[in-house]
């Protein structure tokens, strides 16, 4: 019993992992630029995202734009979109083979089988984490790197935007889920018990003629 | 100390076409946009094309069938090609660095002497 | 391509106080800029972002508005400031400048 909610436990916060990362490609803010202007209501405030830009004024007034094109997305920005839709692509593979392998489900009969398909959906859920951790990291050690560089102009420093606390979170959701599905071994004494039942069940059955 | 300077033929043929450097210094070519703009005699700026950091470009609608930027990172150099040059062709050609990485950080703060380019024969 | 006009030349007095308008054809947000140009130099970026004062630029430059109108204004004119100024949004692909506004001293 321990183990099965230790399986929901672990499929609940990959499912919330993934769905993290889907809110951390979404969210416009991998980098924040504050521009102060001379007085508070020059103020702006520029986002910029895997998808699009928005700039935000000091009246609250944002607009957002697209992306006309690759174009216009810098390098890193465009391997860490790379990067984050692999690992959505990944972490859905991995709820698929979560709910294949559970054991409240009756996808696969073997539950042998069920306790490996979990293993390996703990594995994917594991690799979808390293996926969105290693562009956020990527993202937050450059514009660290920035910061400190005495070489950038102070109205050139960025700041990190929620979508890289976000992947922080998501990538430690999918970490965990993914680990504690790992950790569900395949039950060793499966045959054993097969057998002992149906030699009881025929044993009995003679008894009855 | 970021320089941006242009070079080319100066005199160019009509259906020519021209070949510019623009040679860059004090900062690298793999983290900002570089436009080249032109200009001609007693007139306004006109936008040409960018060549962004991630090595792609953009060109101006009116000229883009004529136009390519390139760029060789390591001798810090972005090109413009222009086939087929006209009589209106003849401006002062410019590069200049943009602020920043992204496509909405166009504006730009350092920018190149300028060359003179006469379409003439 | 979005187009920006401006307003072509203007008159002024040193002292005075004056105000150079440019109208984009859609909405730029707040990604205009502007530029000085002085006769045989290179353009000078005075103000980014509509409001922004580039560095070393004097504090009689300001610029303001967003979306589609935006305005430069100079107060108090120096006779330095003999030039055309020219805008130039960054929102719209491929960007564009402004046919300029020539500014004379009297």
């Known amino acids: 019993m321990a183990s099965m909610g230790l399986q929901v436990m672990g499929i609940a916060l990959a499912v919330l992992g993934w769905l993290a990362v889907m809110l951390c490609c979404a969210l416009p803010m991998w980098r924040v630029t504050a521009f102060i202007g001379s007085n508070i209501v020059t103020s702006q405030t520029i986002w910029e995202g895997l998808w699009m830009n928005c700039v935000v004024q000091s009246t609250g007034q944002m607009q957002c734009k697209v992306y006309d094109s690759l174009l216009a997305l810098p390098q890193d920005l465009q391997a860490a979109r790379a990067l984050v839709i692999i690992s959505i692509i990944v972490a859905a593979l991995g709820v698929l083979l979560s709910v294949v392998g559970g054991k409240c489900t009756n996808c696969l009969e073997d539950e042998s089988a069920k306790a490996k398909t979990m293993i390996v959906a703990g594995v994917v859920f594991l690799l979808a984490g390293l996926m969105v951790i290693v562009p956020v990291s990527w993202t937050a050690h450059n514009i660290i790197q920035d910061f400190y560089n005495p070489l950038v102009a102070s109205g050139q420093k960025r700041e990190m935007g929620a979508s890289l606390y976000v992947g922080w979170a998501a990538s430690g959701l999918l970490l965990l889920g993914g680990g504690l599905l790992c950790c569900n071994c395949p039950p060793r004494t499966d045959k054993p018990y097969s057998a002992k039942y149906s030699a009881a069940r025929s044993a009995a059955a003679s008894n009855y003629v | 100390q970021v320089q941006l300077k242009e070079s080319g033929p100066g005199l160019v043929q009509p259906s020519q076409t021209l070949s510019l450097t623009c040679t860059v210094s004090g900062f690298s070519l793999r983290s900002y946009g570089v436009i080249w703009v032109r200009q001609p005699p007693g007139k306004g700026l006109e936008w040409v094309g960018v060549m962004w950091n991630n090595g792609n470009t953009e060109y101006s609608s009116p000229l883009k069938s004529r136009l390519t930027i390139s760029r060789d990172t390591s001798k810090s150099q972005v090109f413009l090609k222009m086939n087929n040059l006209q009589t209106e062709d003849t401006a002062m050609y410019f590069c200049a660095r943009s602020w920043d990485t992204n496509h909405i950080y166009g504006w730009f703060p350092y920018w190149g002497q300028g060359t003179l380019v006469t379409v003439s024969s | 391509d979005t187009v920006l006009t401006q307003s072509p030349a203007l008159a002024v007095s040193p002292g005075e106080r004056v105000t150079i308008s440019c109208r984009a054809t859609?909405?730029?947000?707040?990604?205009m800029h502007w530029y000085q140009q002085k006769p045989g130099q290179q353009p000078k970026l005075l103000i980014y972002l509509a409001s922004h004062l580039d560095s070393g630029v004097p504090a009689r430059f300001s610029g303001s508005g967003s979306g589609t109108d935006f305005t430069l204004t100079i107060d108090p004119v120096d006779a330095d400031d003999t030039a055309t100024y020219y805008c130039?949004?960054?929102?719209?692909?491929?960007?564009?400048f402004g046919a300029g506004t020539k500014l004379e001293l009297k």
């Open positions: 130039q949004q960054s929102w719209n692909a491929p960007y564009t």
């Open positions: 859609e909405s730029v947000s707040t990604l």
